[in-house]
Interface confidence: low
């Protein structure tokens, strides 16, 4: 058993048929010694008396808010949550496996630049009685500070018969060094509580591996005289790290016909312009990637050819 | 500008070669073994690999003030990785093809380090670990980790040289 926050405790249980459970001793936070009784949740049934209560926690029916009273007055509460371990593996019932980039990916994180700011998100099908708390640090043995905001519901989607809820959180490294080569990973820890079930999820990454620039901005076409060719130009996204002579991007320019089956023409360039042939009804798209480190490409920025 | 008494590197040549290094480091990566060892996690296991750190002056401001600190750090790292790529870790079984990107990477690391330190100019280099000949599982694991770490190192070096070529070239 360990304390998650004031008056909230997590009991770690090996979860298998006829498991013995954990013996837990609760102590009433009071100077009083006599006449103390204990109840669970809204029930008025007295579970025991005295300053301490010893219980055997085996299942969710044994978890909940234990309250000690004296003469009708509430003295203190202890909320017990359960953390299940089945076959040596902690349960992951609350969050959905996003399966990208690999199985057992519950948290996904992205950064738009090297400033030390990043966003993480996760999915669940649970709509109520759900709370999240996020902590982060750089390294784990001698952790350096990362400040995370509160997790918020960022999207709702319908997937077949189910509703899926996306939560996200923004974090900022306290003393980021954008130009340095990271040697210690960022650690993100999410505590999830659904009713009386506690679970925790972690992710470990280098900012360089989660970089995904915003799409190029101000994408423009300029027809070239007496030619089917056009000059495509664009700019670095505003959110990208500066100076651009240091934090450089590379770009992919694609000409795509109306039909998905039509052959795509692709050009790769480090410049912020390119000359391509504009076919009728086609569109031109440009995306960006860090020039020196193969992290994710940005989403496409597109303009029609006509 | 470089410090008085310190010479400026051939920024443009360094830029071209460091960008080539980035490409090679990424093309070599899938060839390190038949397994994706990212499962190992990039835990804090980087004790003996040189990193370009915050105080090394490799940021745009530090380069403007005195690029020599940063260039020395990059040179140390290049020599370190060049030695590792020439060691039993990469030459032993399971053997890589002679024309693999690892061989080109090895040659390019040497080339860039020589551009940074012409004859007769000596910076002290970091001690290279001496590893006994190792087994395939050890080599495959180390190849993967070393190349992952090299990708990050050469990315910072390439940024330094790109910025230098754009803003510090005579």
């Amino acid at each position: 058993i360990w304390e998650l926050k004031k008056d909230v405790y997590v009991v770690e249980l090996d979860w298998y048929p006829d498991a013995p459970g954990e013996m837990v001793v609760l102590t009433c936070d009071t100077p009083e010694e006599d006449g103390i009784t204990w109840t669970l949740d809204q029930s008025s049934e007295v579970l025991g008396s005295g300053k301490t209560l010893t219980i055997q926690v085996k299942e969710f029916g044994d978890a909940g808010q234990y309250t000690c009273h004296k003469g009708g007055e509430v003295l203190s509460h202890s909320l017990l949550l359960l953390h299940k371990k089945e076959d040596g593996i902690w349960s992951t019932d609350i969050l959905k496996d996003q399966k990208e980039p690999k199985n057992k990916t519950f948290l996904r994180c992205e950064a738009k630049n090297y400033s030390g700011r990043f966003t993480c998100w996760w999915l669940t099908t649970i709509s109520t009685d759900l709370t999240f708390s996020v902590k982060s640090s750089r390294g784990s043995s001698d952790p350096q500070g990362v400040t995370c905001g509160a997790a918020t519901l960022s999207a709702e989607r319908v997937r077949g018969d189910n509703k899926e809820y996306e939560y996200s959180v923004e974090c900022q490294e306290d003393s980021a060094c954008p130009a340095a080569e990271e040697s210690l990973p960022i650690e993100v820890m999410v505590d999830a509580v659904h009713k009386l079930k506690y679970e925790n999820y972690t992710s470990s990454f280098f900012i360089r591996d989660i970089i995904k620039p915003d799409p190029p901005k101000n994408l423009q076409l300029k027809p070239l005289k007496n030619s089917r060719q056009v000059e495509v130009s664009w700019e670095y996204p505003d959110t990208w790290s500066t100076p651009h002579s240091y934090f450089s991007l590379t770009f992919c320019v694609q000409v795509q016909g109306k039909s998905k089956r039509e052959k795509k023409d692709r050009v790769f360039t480090d410049k912020t312009s390119a000359t391509v042939i504009c076919r009728k009804n086609a569109s031109i798209s440009v995306r960006a990637q860090d020039r020196y480190y193969s992290s994710s490409w940005s989403e496409w920025a597109s303009v029609p050819c006509s | 500008r470089a410090v008085p008494g310190g010479s400026s590197p051939a920024w443009t040549q360094c830029q071209q070669l460091s960008q080539k290094l980035c490409t090679l480091a990424w093309s070599a990566h899938p060839l390190v073994g038949h397994m994706d060892l990212r499962e190992e996690g990039d835990e804090e296991t980087t004790n003996d690999v040189p990193h370009i750190q915050c105080g090394d002056g490799c940021d745009p401001q530090g380069l403007r003030d005195n690029s020599q600190f940063c260039l020395q750090r990059i040179h140390q790292g290049l020599i370190f990785y060049e030695k590792l790529l020439g060691s039993d870790i990469f030459t032993g079984e399971p053997s890589l093809l002679p024309d693999s990107p690892v061989a080109q990477l090895h040659a390019s690391l040497l080339g860039l380090s020589q551009l940074l330190q012409p004859e007769g100019h000596h910076w002290e280099t970091q001690q290279i670990p001496s590893l006994s000949p190792s087994q395939p599982w050890q080599r495959l694991l180390l190849r993967f980790k070393i190349l992952r770490s090299l990708q990050a190192f050469v990315a910072v070096a390439a940024r330094v040289f790109a910025h230098g070529a754009a803003t510090l070239s005579p």
């Epitope: - | 190992e40 004790n47 006994s132 000949p133 190792s134 087994q135 395939p136 180390l142 980790k145």
Partner: antibody, heavy 117, light 108 residues
Framework: QVELVQSGAEVKKPGSSVKVSCKAS????????ISWVRQAPGQGLEWMGG????????NYAQKFQGRVTITADESTSTAYMELSSLRSEDTAVYYC??????????WGQGTLVTVSS | DIVLTQSPATLSLSPGERATLSCRAS???????LAWYQQKPGQAPRLLIY???SRATGVPARFSGSGSGTDFTLTISSLEPEDFAVYYC?????????FGQGTKVEIK
């Protein structure tokens, strides 16, 4: 002459963890790998994983992935193997061995871990 | 993972006789990275042969290893009383190293 000395026998409850140590003396600890091999009573040898102390890099057998953690402390020339969520079938003698190109040439004396409720 | 199958499971011989132990791999062992170990009751294994045929330091000449690819053999030319033990083959030519199940050489 390299010698590997392991920690003493352990008795553990199901669901708990055990951490076995392996201290090297008489050689350069960092220059080779340390592997961990276990042997259940009356059974054969089973490789669990290994570590290269100089780099701290570990490699684990698929069967133990997620349950075993192998670490090394260069300052004390000691390697550690921690096995979590113990079950009765983890009762075995656990050996550390110096793992070089010539196979496992130096072995610890073994540590008996008994898992029983 | 490469599976190593040792045969026979038990070999009953008398001192002075020749012992031939076989180890077959489910796929070719890279670089013939195959070792043989001897284990006596209550003791840690001892390395005898590495690289399929090289004798480890201090191992008597009566022990020899041969074979390549998927078929390997440990031969004890003339059994001494101290040679009665369990013998394991071990491949270390892949990212996941594996052992055979062992052959027990017992006194007939």
């Amino acid at each position: 002459q390299v010698e590997l000395v392991q920690s003493g026998a352990e008795v553990k409850k199901p669901g708990s963890s055990v951490k076995v140590s392996c201290k090297a003396s008489g050689g350069t600890f960092s220059n080779y790998a340390i592997s961990w091999v276990r042997q259940a009573p009356g059974q054969g040898l089973e490789w669990m994983g290994g570590i290269i102390p100089m780099f701290g890099y570990a490699n684990y057998a698929q069967k133990f992935q997620g349950r075993v953690t192998i670490t090394a402390d260069e300052s004390t020339s000691t390697a550690y193997m921690e096995l979590s969520s113990l079950r009765s079938e983890d009762t075995a003698v656990y050996y550390c061995a110096r793992d070089i190109y010539a196979g496992m040439d130096v072995w610890g004396q073994g540590t008996l871990v008994t898992v029983s409720s | 993972d490469i599976v190593l199958t040792q045969s026979p499971a038990t070999l009953s011989l008398s001192p002075g006789e020749r012992a031939t132990l076989s180890c077959r791999a489910s796929q070719s062992v890279l670089g013939n990275y195959l070792a043989w170990y001897q284990q006596k009751p209550g003791q840690a294994p001892r390395l005898l042969i590495y690289g399929a045929s090289s004798r480890a330091t201090g191992v008597p000449a009566r022990f020899s290893g041969s074979g390549s690819g998927t078929d390997f053999t440990l031969t004890i030319s003339s059994l001494e009383p101290e040679d009665f033990a369990v013998y394991y083959c071990h491949q270390y030519g892949s990212i996941s190293t594996t052992f055979g199940q062992g052959t027990k050489v017992e006194i007939k």
